[in-house]
């Protein structure tokens, strides 16, 4: 229903705390370089204005759209052009073009230092002095680094952060309590960021129809007892909510997400038997819990999929006269029977079914033609199953770090033109799939592995799109979203690549490496590994193992030496010479 004042409506629905958090996220995602203090000033102004509209919906400017109000605020920032260059040109446009322009200027890889967690004591002091400001900084820092982070979910992580600090800051050993708990929140949030970026990519590149198909498959897996009409309603709502968040309509998105949670909890009987525990929680936790809900039990008496989609005489009639609905019911029926498949695989199967009907329904004897379609799914199913098997075996053999290195070598060979930091980031994330998925029960491995890999590869595509350097990457990234992972898996060594010149400085290290945290040390070594592969793309596994083993020993030896600097200065050139020789 239409409201006189959109901003008053959202303020009343969301409450002041969530309203302010969402406005802060919105501004931080649009203007990623602005300091917290500048954004918080704007947030306060917007909040005060919203309160005047709650008091009187007819007050001046209260009838303006939220995009207009937010855009006007952003465009009034002094020195906008100095700090943001081209983005300032957006301010010459009218809505909705102005908002579209802001969206196009979101930077997936902003030039910001990595978010450093303060020392435990310092963190607790500033949290206890001003919890609101502390959590505001958290929202700001995450949102500016992840301009597509799902805003209501980020509020949930801020709430988790708050809980951890409240609990741990009273402990005697604050660091021991905080570190593992905050690491867990950080890990979950980073995965959430790449997953949501994938959803926004899907929406941006392929539109609502493609996203809705994804949602139908996902919901059907989770809620196999729900009717198709119920699944369609949920998928339509989820599509609308994600479109809003991806489009910067964060207040509407969060409000609609809360509404959807309310609807699901009021209609548990027709959705799933697993919802009750979620429905007893407060709003942010309730929505998050519902988003992560375990699959309901599959109905025992489901007929064979063939009865409806192969054996019926009027398959082609349904396909011709109600194409989208028919393919939707196919996706629903197949997905509810296969919680053990990835959504990407289910969408590939639906696409294969569609292509088969497109071909067969134009032929003389359609049933004879499409009669074997289900058997033709077999290779499509086997391919990701084999991928999971071989990669999990490799992970179990090498451990996470070793597995990341194997992935790094593989991907550097596939796309050596891609920048080393991007390759290292991608390989580290791809390599985490082992820890995340390979320890799960068999039935959960495939969906975990493939849907996670798809999200990480989407991040690679988003970064590559900004500065395209590899034709092979461009080709895989330009195709359909569900074909990306198989496309990347199928890439081999890029034969067109001219190896990089061997530069001694790339492999020159200093004593500062000794004091780095383990993670940073690993990144340094992995950077060197990628550079080695760029120098010798056809180096054998044994050659690379030798060189990297030698390198690890060198670092270890010099970090234990009395005169570290001298050790690095004298042993370094020897290492470089030995490496060149080993790779000759």
């Amino acid at each position: 229903e239409a409201h006189k004042s959109e901003i008053a409506h959202r303020f009343k629905d969301l409450g002041e705390q969530h309203f302010k958090g969402l406005v802060l996220i919105a501004f931080s995602q649009y203007l990623q370089k602005c300091p917290y203090e500048e954004h918080i000033k704007l947030v306060q102004e917007v909040t005060d204005f919203a309160k005047t509209c709650v008091a009187d919906e007819n007050a001046e400017n209260c009838d303006k759209s939220i995009h207009t109000l937010f855009g006007d605020k952003l465009c009034a920032i002094p020195k906008l052009r100095d700090n943001y260059g081209e983005l300032a040109d957006c301010c010459a446009k009218q809505e909705p073009e102005r908002n579209e322009c802001f969206l196009q200027h979101k930077d997936d890889n902003p030039n910001l230092p990595p978010f450093q967690r303060p020392e435990a004591e310092a963190m607790c002091t500033s949290f206890q002095e001003n919890p609101t400001s502390f959590l505001g900084h958290y929202l700001h820092e995450v949102a500016r680094r992840h301009p597509y982070f799902y805003a209501p979910e980020l509020l949930y992580y801020a709430e988790k952060y708050n809980e951890v600090l409240t609990q741990c800051c009273t402990e005697s050993d604050k660091a021991a309590c905080l570190t593992p708990k905050l690491d867990a929140v950080k890990e979950k949030a980073l995965v959430a960021a790449v997953r949501q970026r994938m959803k926004c990519s899907s929406m941006q590149r392929f539109g609502e129809r493609a996203f809705k198909a994804w949602a139908v498959a996902r919901m059907s897996q989770r809620f196999p007892n729900a009717e198709f009409a119920e699944i369609t309603k949920l998928a339509t709502d989820v599509t609308k909510i994600n479109k809003e968040c991806c489009h910067g309509d964060l207040l509407e998105c969060a409000d609609d997400r809360a509404e959807l949670a309310k609807y699901m909890c009021e209609n548990q009987a027709t959705i799933s038997s697993k919802l009750q525990a979620c429905c007893d929680k407060p709003v942010l936790q309730k929505s998050q819990c519902l988003a992560e809900i375990e699959h309901d039990n599959i109905p025992a008496d489901l007929p064979s999929i063939a009865a409806d989609f192969v054996e019926d005489k009027e398959v082609c009639k349904n396909y011709a006269e109600a194409k989208d609905v028919f393919l939707g019911t196919f996706l629903y029926e197949y997905s509810r029977r296969h919680p053990d498949y990835s959504v990407s695989l289910l969408l590939r199967l639906a696409k294969k079914y569609e292509a088969t009907l497109e071909k067969c329904c134009a032929e003389g004897d359609p049933p004879a033609c499409y009669g074997t379609v289900l058997a033709e799914f077999q290779p499509l199913v086997e391919e990701p199953k084999n991928l999971v098997k071989t990669n999990c075996e490799l992970y179990e053999k090498l451990g996470e770090y070793g597995f990341q290195n194997a992935v790094l070598v593989r991907y550097t060979q596939k796309a050596p033109q891609v920048s080393t930091p991007t390759l290292v980031e991608a390989a580290r994330n791809l390599g985490r799939v082992g820890t995340k998925c390979c320890t799960l029960p068999e039935a959960q491995r495939l969906p975990c592995v493939e849907d996670y890999l798809s999200a990480i590869l989407n991040r690679l595509c988003v970064l590559h799109e900004k500065t395209p350097v590899s034709e092979k990457v461009t080709k895989c990234c330009s195709g359909s979203l569900v074909e990306r992972r198989p496309c990347f898996s199928a890439l081999t060594v890029d034969e067109t690549y001219v190896p990089k010149e061997f530069k001694a400085e790339t492999f020159t290290f200093h004593s500062d490496i000794c004091t780095l945290p383990d993670k940073e040390k690993q990144i340094k070594k992995q950077t060197a590994l990628a550079e080695l592969v760029k120098h010798k793309p056809k180096a054998t596994e044994d050659q690379l193992k030798t060189v990297m083993g030698d390198f690890a020993q060198f670092v270890d030896k010099c970090c234990k030496a009395a005169d570290k600097d001298n050790c690095f200065a004298t042993e370094g050139p020897n290492l470089v010479a030995r490496s060149k020789e080993a790779l000759a």
């Epitope: 198709f228 009409a229 369609t232 027709t270 409806d308 019926d312 349904n318 006269e321 109600a322 019911t329």
Partner: nanobody, 126 residues
Framework: EVQLLESGGGLVQPGGSLRLSCAAS????????VAWFRQAPGKEREFVAG????????YYADSVKGRFTISRDNSKNTLYLQMNSLRPEDTAVYYC???????????????????WGQGTLVTVSS
């Protein structure tokens, strides 16, 4: 739960007409495809006609094509089967059936339909 209730059956002469109604209720009923089946004494239940839910699509058995017309009025949650040029072999108990939430008739196999009305008898005889 879907509930279905047929009415309109009766005795009619060959060549005559009859209109059957099926009152349907339940969640998402207007988005659910509904079918008419019939069962003659000593025979299997056979599919007669069907109509999509929220989708403008109709289905007919070859034996009734051109003589029977299926329609629905969602404002009244009622399904109709207009039967013209009736023949003695059309004599049977007519049932309406539904697969909840399924917008299309994707199968004519009676066993796949969990919800049935109690049936209405149609007798075509001179």
């Amino acid at each position: 739960e879907v509930q279905l209730l047929e009415s309109g059956g009766g005795l009619v002469q060959p060549g005559g007409s009859l209109r059957l109604s099926c009152a349907a209720s339940g969640r998402y009923i207007d988005e659910t495809a509904v079918a008419w089946f019939r069962q003659a004494p000593g025979k299997e239940r056979e599919f007669v006609a069907g109509i999509g839910g929220g989708v403008d699509i109709t289905y007919y058995a070859d034996s009734v094509k051109g003589r029977f017309t299926i329609s629905r009025d969602n404002s009244k949650n009622t399904l109709y089967l207009q039967m013209n040029s009736l023949r003695p072999e059309d004599t049977a108990v007519y049932y309406c059936a539904a697969r909840p939430g399924q917008p299309l008739i994707t199968s004519k196999v009676a066993d796949l339909y969990p919800y049935w009305g109690q049936g209405t008898l149609v007798t075509v005889s001179s």
